[in-house]
Structure formats: C-alpha cells, structure tokens
C-alpha cells in the first residue's frame, strides 16, 4: 500500500526569536505530507499546518498564548492524496519535538540603538524597545512588557579612535554614560537575560557612532 | 558544576611571552564574559581585562594595555590571555574568572590561578 | 578610574566578634559593589553582590549595606574559618576596580 512509502519526520527543531516560533523538521516530502499538531504538558493537542508539504510549521499564534507554558508538538506524515490512509499501527506516522519553553528558550532578536545624546560629558543611549507578536488585551506588547526586569542590556561603547569596549548595564532601555570631551565615541547593545541558563544573549546591534545622524549633541 | 582551570603558567625571562589558557567546564563561555585578574605575591587582586566570547570585545587595564591580548575559543570553550613583552611587575597569580553578566551579581566563579614569575 | 578606599587594611579580632570593614567609592556606583573573601593560597570566593544582597551557600552572618559611596561587610560572629582578607569590588563601570584588602587576623 502507498503507507509503505510514508517516512517519519525527523530533526523536529524549534526556531524561535522574539516569540516568533517555526517548528522546522526533515525529510523534504517524497509523495507524502505533513501535519503538524501542538500541545501543553497539560493541554489537548491543536492541529496546524494541515497536509502540507512544507518542512516548517509557524506556531506563533499558540504559543503566544501563554509564554511561560512549556509546549509539545508533533508531526504526522500522511501519503499524499491518501491523508485518510494510516500506518501498520492503525495511525499514521509521528514524530515528537522536543519540549518548548517560549519565555526561557526564544532567541533574543538583534536589538537596535534607537537613539543617543550628549550633554557635555554624559551620553544619553536609547535602545529601541521591538514589539513581540505576544499580546494582551489585543495589544502586542514588547520585549520589555513579556520580560520586565529580567531582560538586561548591556552596552558596549569605545572612542572612535581605539579599540578597548567598555561596558555599562541597565535594566531599562535608557543608558547615561560618562564621556571624556572632544571624543567620538561608537555604540553597540546587545540584550541578555542573566536568569537563563542559555541563549542568554542576542547577538550584538549595529554600531552607531557619534557624529552620525542617529545622535544629537548639545555643548552645555 | 561550575569550573575554571588556567593553566601555561611559568617562569620567564623579562621581555618574553607566555600565553596561559582557561579551561571552562558546566556552563558555555560564550553566554557569559571572562575576566582575567591578577595578584602579585603578598599583595591585592588587579584586574586584567575581559573579553565577551559571544563577540570577541575586549577592555584592558592600562598597565597592560598594548602587551596582553585576551582571546576566547568557543569551540574549546576556553579563554586565553596571551602575555607579551612581560615585566618583572607581571609577576603574579593569574586567575581567570567568570561574569555572571547581571546588574547585580559580577564574577561569581573564579579559577584555582595559575602563578606566572618574570625573572632573569 | 574610580577608586576603591577599604579601610582598615588588617584588623585583629577574637571568634564571637562583630567585625565591621568599610569601602569608598571614589565616585557614584550605585549597588555595584561586591565583597569576596580570599584565603591563603585560594581563590577568592563571593560573599555579597549588589551591595548587600547574600551570594548562594553564604553564612548568614555576613551582610552588606550602603550608604551613598560607602559600603559596609559586617561579619556579626566571626567564625574560625572566616579568618581570612576581604576585598570589595565596584563593577559599576569599566574598569571594574578592587579595594586594597581587609586582612582579618585571630587576636
């Protein structure tokens, strides 16, 4: 029968950042397709992605729903033009993902230097606060809303003219730093939440230097 | 479990090199950053420098500043501090350690140290 | 570079005391400040974080408190093992500097 052709997906992995989550898995369809279903440790399964001959599921709409929860899902392989036809066990072919936590697990998305200004000696750095696809109360809200105060920025800063970084820290999106007079000085964010034990850290913001349009400079 | 092991230390000769290594185990250096301090015998802890693994940014004190240069394997999850043109004032206990990379909590794990003596 | 002044620099003192060490930033760090304490031979090991917040594993006899650019490690029955020199640490802004050291010594 056509099911002796079906094959289990396989490398079920979950691509996450800023909450926008694909479940990606292999084989590329050969005459069959897919179907994706997720759940909660606790919950009853939700089916997505129905008889599709992708290799990738967007699963942001569930699991947006509540960050915290740990999700499950599973991918069912069905001959193509026979989705009603099951395997040997009486059901068709799965394969389960490996457990997803959105709020320890998403990748944190490359952050963005809103804004910086210098007031004699002191910079004044803003970094841009990117809206998440998790709402509440039908608004999106972003990625300091989802994660308060967990949620760090760590900002590298150096004259244009050397190389050493040097560091500061908020629990906000605003930095005031010391400058010395006269210097130009480049910028670059990166977002970190120190609580987890990994994909603690995004990767690096562009740089933006002063005497550049994003900055302002007043002489007090 | 956490560890830090620094090894490559040694006696040389002033105006030689030496290039001590910091071996982490039970966590992956490239979520966290990596400080090397130092302390000379009988006397306090200096800091170094650092380095963030995940981007290969540095900060050097100024008595080493130009001479030392700090560098991060991450596929061997180790950290390195390569120490050229050494004076007899870099003699000392190398310790590397490890950023915890909150606002609160800084170094909160520290190698055993490994003792590098510039002599003639 | 802000400067860390910790006084005294050695202090005798007799198991049961209440040992009080002090630090001075030379300029505004916040909290950023920590206290480690280092044997002999050893590595320094953390004992307050954040000015006076109790690292994991550490007796409850240590605490830290702030007030403006001073900071204070209070040890309030010093223990046998707890003989041993003290350093705070401002990581407040690059570079993070250390205070000269408390030597605690057994009267």
């Known amino acids: 029968s056509g099911t002796t052709n079906t094959v289990a997906a396989y490398n079920l992995t979950w691509k996450s950042t800023n909450f926008k989550t694909i479940l990606e898995w292999e084989p590329k369809p050969v005459n069959q397709v897919y179907t994706v279903q997720i759940s909660t440790k606790s919950g009853d399964w939700k089916s997505k992605c129905f008889y599709t001959t992708d290799t990738e599921c967007d699963l942001t709409d569930e699991i947006v729903k509540d960050v915290k929860q740990t999700y499950l899902a599973r991918v069912f392989s069905y001959p193509a033009g026979n989705v009603e036809s099951t395997g040997s066990a009486g059901e068709p072919l799965y394969e389960n993902s490996p457990e997803f936590t959105p709020y320890l697990e998403t990748n944190l998305g490359q952050p963005t230097i809103q804004s910086f200004e210098q007031v004699g000696t002191k910079v004044n750095v803003t970094v841009e606060d990117e809206r998440t696809l998790v709402r509440r109360n039908n608004t999106f809200l972003s990625l300091r809303d989802v994660f308060g105060k967990d949620l760090i920025y760590t900002l590298y800063y150096w004259k244009s003219s050397s190389s050493g970084k040097k560091t500061a820290k908020t629990n906000t999106n605003e930095f005031l730093i010391d400058v010395d007079k006269g210097e130009n000085y480049c910028f670059s964010v990166q977002a970190v939440i120190p609580s987890r034990t990994v994909n603690r850290k995004s990767t690096d913001s562009p740089v933006e230097c002063m005497g550049q349009e994003k900055g302002e400079f007043r002489e007090i | 479990e956490v560890q830090l092991v620094e090894s490559g230390g040694g006696l040389v000769q002033p105006g030689g090199s030496l290039r001590l290594s910091c071996a982490a185990s039970?966590?992956?250096?490239?979520?966290?950053?990596i400080h090397w301090v130092r302390q000379a015998p009988g006397k306090g802890l200096e800091w170094v420098g650092y380095?963030?693994?995940?981007?290969?940014?540095?900060y050097y004190a100024d008595s080493v500043k130009g001479r030392f240069t700090i560098s991060a394997d991450t596929s061997k999850n180790t950290a390195y501090l390569q120490m050229n043109s050494l004076r007899a004032e870099d003699t000392a206990v190398y310790y590397c350690a490890r950023d915890y990379g909150s606002l609160q909590v800084f170094i909160d794990y520290w190698g055993q140290g490994t003792l590098v003596t510039v002599s003639s | 570079d802000i400067q860390m002044t910790q006084s005294p620099s050695s202090l005798s003192a007799s198991v049961g005391d209440r040992v009080t060490i002090t630090c001075r930033a030379s300029?505004?760090?916040?909290?950023?400040v920590a206290w480690y304490q280092q044997k002999p031979g050893k590595a320094p090991k953390l004992l307050i974080y954040?000015?006076?917040f109790l690292y994991s594993g550490v007796p409850s006899r240590f605490s830290g408190s702030r007030s403006g650019t001073d900071f204070t490690l209070t040890i309030s029955s010093l223990q046998p093992e707890d003989f041993a020199t003290y350093y705070c640490?401002?990581?407040?802004?690059?570079?993070?500097?250390f205070g000269q050291g408390t030597k605690v010594e057994i009267k």
């Open positions: 380095i963030d693994p995940y981007n290969g940014f540095t």
């Open positions: 640490q401002q990581h407040y802004t690059t570079p993070p500097t």
């Open positions: 954040s000015a006076s």
């Open positions: 300029q505004d760090v916040n909290t950023a």
């Open positions: 039970g966590f992956t250096i490239s979520d966290y950053w």
